[in-house]
Interface confidence: low
């Protein structure tokens, strides 16, 4: 059988008639910033062009002996994972290597910066098709390295990086912490986070997704036909760079935001055992393992959304946390979460011409997170409608009153330290689905959007008895855009979206008061775009889709002839 | 030795051609910041990335780098400009004593300065 990692990223067979020759990624150029490589290895020969770029520090230690095979080991293996003839993800992708890591696998932030600048200048001088840059390296948090990655990403380059092998929060490392970069953690054949000695894969909100990164067979620099097994978040990032190359080759017009959303959408969901992560990181870490899409077409109609968590606000009374979407994503809803339950809600507000999601800490609280729901909604026109706290006991309400605008999310924010137990009616007046309902002492914010063919509906799941978690999911064909809790009382810790499910968390049952006070309703807003679906159907009619996974079919047949020795 | 002589010659020229005045002092109220790696063993003191404000042109980056060299030379410090950035971020990479950071942070166009640090294969 083919190696476990290639099997894992291949979705179940889609359509038998969708065979494609194994040349996926042929329209894409992948830049690798790593060690030197053995470019004449049979796995990558003719696929990798070694540029003249080299910026590395001297090796440490007087007794260090430069040995070509050791110097080339890391980079050669990764080039093989991305585009290797036998064990590569995107067999058609062409690669260019830049040497920024020395024979000990060490480099500098400045050398990496100069390498990124070299890529930018090459792109200016000779614009080619889509570019993917693989950064299988990590250092401490670096403002300048993150800034350079942001600039390159905004010039249309897709950057993929390793989350880091420090069994730590990826946000403490660069370039893993750069929001514009696709940051990849590592999982093993059992879908467990990878342990590496006493350490392991990084985790947390700065990780976008995980990918196979343990016991990965690939080109060895020991000889031109040797193979070796290596592990690490670099290997995981190389898988995602290969998948990205395949996707971009199939759809060269994809923007970074579209690509990231597709990577998330086509990932295997909820397969990672989260117990491996520290408890406070579990909710922040995406439970996603990268996979190829089942088909090159058919994704266009989907309304894609992802959840973006802010950094922690910190515990001061007036502390706030802000979550932002990427430049070409729309913020469709905003929620907040606090482990202590002490928070003053959240609101959507304009910042630099774009909506952001801001969560507010409360007195005595240990801090809050803001959670943004970021979606791809072409030609969208979204605005926030606010209702101040209501005087009446009925609670605060706000609805989308503009013609053609639909409700995509509800937020509530309050100034008082404790909202108390007042509960607004959970049931809305009939015929008014486009409205948000909240506590009478809270201001309510409705996200109202107009986009071609956009339709949304509200779905609620109420539990009368106290429960730590209440969920409600959108059905097939609908995408979760908004997630909030009713009522917004103090025992609710907050609400957040996990894939297509709205999760409302409450305080431990033993700490909540009476049964009636414990009643919680999870409110999901589910949307779809008839406009996108229609455009996709027209495309399907004129073009026969070609399955990316079928690229591996030829491989499955021939794999058993080679490399059954694993190391 | 040759390399150092070359540097010295460059500094002498810089001294003659650069004014040490405040003609291009930073705008009132804007202070450049200094950053360094939180993980001490990964720090590389002595090499700094000087990042200039977003709209700074290449010629201004070069002029700022020369001005730093000239002002450092007046104080008896040798500096070396290792690279001038443009295309992604405006700025330059400089090898210098950490004693000069305060001086460098006051240069015109400077947004922030970051001490170089190590990165590792993962």
């Amino acid at each position: 059988s083919i190696p476990w990692n290639l099997e894992r990223i291949t979705p179940p067979r889609y359509r038998a008639d969708e065979y494609q020759p194994p040349d996926g990624g042929s329209l894409v150029e992948v830049y690798l910033l790593d060690t030197s490589i053995q470019s004449d290895h049979r796995e990558i020969e003719g696929r990798v062009m070694v540029t003249d770029f080299e910026n590395v520090p001297e090796e440490d230690g007087t007794r260090f002996h430069r040995q070509a095979s050791k110097c080339d080991s890391h980079g050669t293996h990764l080039a093989g994972v991305v585009s290797g003839r036998d064990a590569g993800v995107a067999k058609g992708a062409s690669m260019r290597s830049l040497r920024v890591l020395n024979c000990q696998g060490k480099g500098t932030v400045s050398g990496t910066l100069i390498g990124l600048e070299f890529i930018r200048k090459s792109q200016l001088v000779q614009p080619v098709g889509p570019l993917v840059v693989l950064l299988p390296l990590a250092g401490g948090y670096s403002r300048v390295l993150n800034a350079a990655c942001q600039r390159l990403a905004r010039a249309g380059v897709v950057l993929v990086t390793a989350a880091g092998n420090f069994r730590d929060d990826a946000c403490l490392y660069s370039p893993a912490s750069a929001p514009e970069v696709i940051t990849v953690g590592a999982t093993n054949a059992q879908d467990q986070p990878v342990t590496l000695g006493t350490l392991g894969t990084n985790f947390g909100r700065c990780v976008d997704l995980f990918a196979p990164g343990e016991d990965i067979i690939g080109a060895s620099s020991d000889c031109s036909t040797c193979f070796v097994s290596q592990s690490g978040t670099s290997q995981a990032a190389a898988h995602v760079a290969g998948i990205a190359a395949m996707m971009l080759s199939a759809e060269p017009e994809l923007t970074l935001a579209e690509l990231r959303q597709r990577l998330i959408h086509f990932s295997a969901k909820d397969v990672i055992n989260e117990a491996w992560f520290p408890e406070d990181q579990r909710v922040l870490t995406p439970n996603l393992v990268a996979a190829l899409p089942p088909s090159t077409h058919g994704a266009g109609w989907q309304l894609f959304c992802r959840t973006v968590w802010s950094a922690h606000s910190g515990p001061t009374r007036m502390a706030t946390a802000v979550a932002r979407c990427a430049p070409d994503e729309e913020l469709l809803s905003c929620s907040s979460f606090s482990r202590s339950g002490k928070r003053r809600g959240e609101r959507m507000e304009a910042q630099g011409g774009k909506l952001v999601c801001r969560a507010h800490n409360a007195f005595g609280g240990e801090g809050v997170y803001a959670i943004a729901r970021c979606c791809l909604l072409p030609q969208a026109n979204c605005s926030v409608h606010t209702a101040p706290p209501a005087e009446a006991s009925m609670g605060t309400r706000v609805h989308c009153h503009q013609q053609g605008h639909v409700l995509t999310g509800c937020s509530s924010h309050w100034e008082v330290e404790d909202l108390g137990t007042h509960k607004p009616p959970v049931l809305r007046p009939r015929g008014q689905p486009n409205q948000c309902v909240g506590h009478r002492e809270a201001s309510i914010h409705a996200s109202c959007c107009h986009a071609p063919g956009l339709e949304c509906k509200v779905k609620e799941h109420g539990i009368p008895a106290p429960q730590e978690q209440v969920t409600v999911a959108c059905e097939e064909g609908w995408t979760l855009t908004g997630c909030s809790a009713l009522p917004g009382t103090s025992h609710v810790l907050g609400a957040y979206a996990v894939d297509n499910t709205c999760v409302v968390r409450s305080r431990d049952v033993s700490t909540t008061g009476s049964t009636s006070e414990g009643a919680v309703t999870a409110v999901a807003i589910c949307c779809r775009s008839r406009h996108l679906a229609q455009a996709s159907q027209e495309l399907q009619g004129s073009t026969s889709g070609s399955g990316l996974n079928d690229i591996f079919e030829a491989q499955k047949i021939e794999w058993h002839e080679h490399h059954h020795h694993h190391h | 030795q040759e390399d150092e002589d070359g540097d010295y010659e460059e500094l002498v020229l810089a001294l003659r051609s650069e004014e040490d005045g405040l003609a291009e002092a930073p705008e009132h109220g804007t202070t450049a910041t200094f950053h360094r790696c939180a993980k001490d063993p990964w720090r590389l003191p002595g090499t700094y990335v000087v990042v200039l404000k977003e709209e700074t042109h290449l010629s201004q980056s070069e002029r700022t780098a020369r001005r730093l060299q000239a002002q450092a030379a007046r104080r008896g410090y040798l500096t070396k400009i290792l690279h001038v950035f443009h295309g992604l971020l405006p700025g330059f990479l400089v090898k210098m004593s950490g004693d000069l950071l305060e001086l460098a942070l006051k240069l015109p166009h400077v947004d922030y300065i970051e001490e170089d640090s190590s990165v590792f294969a993962q």
Partner: antibody, heavy 121, light 112 residues
Framework: QVQLVQSGAEVKKPGASVKVSCKAS????????MHWVRQAPGQGLEWMGY????????KYHQNFKDRVTMTADKSISTAYMELSRLTSDDTAVYYC??????????????WGQGTTVTVSS | DIQMSQSPSSLSASVGDRVTITCKSS????????????LAWYQQKPGKAPKLLIY???TRESGVPDRFSGSGSGTDFTLTISSLQPEDFATYYC????????FGQGTKLEIK
């Protein structure tokens, strides 16, 4: 001001080589790429290749690949284009042109005055 | 290789006339990432080097009079001179830089 000044006219015999120089001034030589374009009498413009002076990286048009060599001397801000095995078809005006490096297109904003190369027996 | 074809190859016009030159490429010059068309227009007078007029298909180089304008996207492009001046009689070339470089064969603009 920014200028590209090329060497003077040359007359060469078939089979010989010619080396045309292009001296840059008024800008940082290393930060711009230098292209060479030629124009036969009464004909259009034909791109020959480019050099990145800071790295020495070159890219040549297929038609000239095995006959052209582009070099640069950073110390005197000068680019060179050498064409070997000349034939009468190589009689043309040869231009150097600078590529503007700040934006996302590759266009030539400054040109040399041109060097006339005549190949005649 | 990308081919560029310009039309007409020559045309006669008078001062004050509005003139249009077209340029077709054998494949799209639109870069999907930057959303820019990699096409430039140059003007060349006899015995002189070419001069950049327009880049990104429609952006005028600084110092170029606003009577020159460029338009088009993908494979079809146009250079328009809204009101011919005596100094505009020259040869005009389009050039693609999407994949290496190719110039059009040129359009000679003569006085009628």
């Amino acid at each position: 001001q920014v200028q590209l000044v090329q060497s003077g006219a040359e007359v060469k015999k078939p089979g010989a080589s010619v080396k045309v120089s292009c001296k840059a001034s008024g800008y940082t030589f290393n930060d711009y790429w230098m292209h060479w374009v030629r124009q036969a009498p009464g004909q259009g413009l034909e791109w020959m290749g480019y050099i990145n002076p800071s790295s020495g990286f070159t890219k040549y048009h297929q038609n000239f690949k095995d006959r052209v060599t582009m070099t640069a001397d950073k110390s005197i801000s000068t680019a060179y284009m050498e064409l070997s095995r000349l034939t009468s078809d190589d009689t043309a005006v040869y231009y150097c042109a600078r590529q503007y490096d700040y934006d996302e297109d590759w266009y030539f904003d400054v040109w040399g005055q041109g060097t006339t190369v005549t190949v005649s027996s | 290789d990308i081919q560029m074809s310009q039309s007409p190859s020559s045309l006669s016009a008078s001062v004050g006339d509005r003139v249009t030159i077209t340029c077709k490429s054998s494949q799209s010059l639109l870069n999907s990432r930057t959303r820019k068309n990699f096409l430039a227009w140059y003007q060349q007078k006899p015995g002189k080097a070419p001069k950049l007029l327009i880049y990104w298909a429609s952006t005028r180089e600084s110092g170029v009079p606003d009577r020159f304008s460029g338009s088009g996207s993908g494979t079809d492009f146009t250079l328009t001179i809204s009101s011919l001046q005596p100094e505009d009689f020259a040869t005009y070339y389009c050039k693609q830089s999407f994949n290496l470089f190719t110039f059009g064969q040129g359009t000679k603009l003569e006085i009628k």
